[in-house]
């Protein structure tokens, strides 16, 4: 029969066959032959895979550090990494918590909506048109464009949420 | 290295004033919006004021609003925490920092003491 060119789903192609792939948690110790399948190994401790793999090395658990204010809300397992989070009082500075500030900023283009408090963290809020925010800021709002007219001055460059406008002077048409 | 070192903090009657000051190196300080922080004994830390790059934005936690004023100057590198009718319930060690605000770099702080 002719060699298969693609294989089932939880499996993978090698040596022109079809082998298993190792289920999460487990490690890839050798390759299925015709004779033989795919041999997989558990993790060690504090070691994980979260998918059908062919790994051959499983991925360390994550550390919290407590020197960066992370302790462990979240403890790994063999098919899931450790999950982080900050000490009482203090916020996480991404989504992958690696690592902590008493307050999150808000970024360019964002700006407060509440800031924060003992209890919970800063509220940003996406700058709507006519306003802009060029800093990142755990205080402050988000700026109104600059009224060109105001000053007798016209457009020369729109703003966006994260710049003013550029105002310039008027062409003055001759008669 | 980001270095800041708050000093200005001592021992003072309920109703007098205190000027802290925060020599800060290491970073461009104008860029930076600044922050004070304290820590009472045997509490969290909260956050006091805190100032834009410019200086222009200034910012109060409510327990002090009124009371206290906050002022840089970017020319000396300086952020400063202006501390009027001070009362008991402020006696703590004082932190300034850049925001945001790390766990693991908090400088060194100055302690100050209201008591009669």
């Known amino acids: 029969p002719e060699p298969p060119t693609a294989c089932r789903e939880k499996q993978y192609l090698i040596n022109s066959q079809c082998c298993s792939l190792c289920q999460p948690g487990q490690k890839l110790v050798s390759d299925c032959t015709e004779f033989t399948e795919t041999e997989c190994l558990p993790c060690g401790e504090s070691e994980f895979l979260d998918t059908w793999n062919r790994e051959t090395h499983c991925h360390q658990h994550k550390y919290c550090d407590p020197n960066l204010g992370l302790r462990v809300q979240q403890k790994g397992t063999s098919e899931t990494d450790t999950i982080c989070t900050c000490e009482e009082g203090w916020h996480c500075t991404s989504e992958a918590c690696e690592s902590c500030v008493l307050h999150r900023s808000c970024s360019p283009g964002f700006g407060v909506k509440q800031i924060a408090t003992g209890v919970s963290d800063t509220i940003c809020e996406p700058c709507p048109v006519g306003f802009f925010s060029n800093v990142s800021s755990a205080f402050e709002k988000c700026h109104p464009w600059t009224s060109c007219e105001t000053k007798d001055l016209v457009v020369q460059q729109a703003g966006t949420n994260k710049t003013d406008v550029v105002c310039g002077p008027q062409d003055r048409l001759r008669a | 290295e980001v270095q800041l070192l708050a000093s200005g903090g001592g021992l003072v009657q309920p109703g007098g004033s205190l000027r802290l000051s925060c020599a800060a190196s290491?970073?461009?300080?104008?860029?930076?919006?600044m922050i004070w922080v304290r820590q009472a004994p045997g509490k969290g830390l909260e956050w006091v004021s805190a100032?834009?790059?410019?200086?222009?934005?200034?910012y109060y936690a409510d327990s002090v609003k009124g009371r206290f004023t906050i002022s840089r100057d970017n020319s000396k590198n300086t952020l400063y925490l202006q501390m009027n009718s001070l009362r008991a319930e402020d006696t703590a060690v004082y932190y300034c920092?850049?925001?945001?605000?790390?766990?693991?770099?908090w400088g060194q702080g100055t302690l100050v003491t209201v008591s009669s």
């Open positions: 100032i834009s790059g410019s200086g222009g934005g200034t």
């Open positions: 290491g970073f461009t300080f104008e860029e930076e919006e």
């Open positions: 920092g850049k925001e945001p605000f790390r766990y693991d770099y």
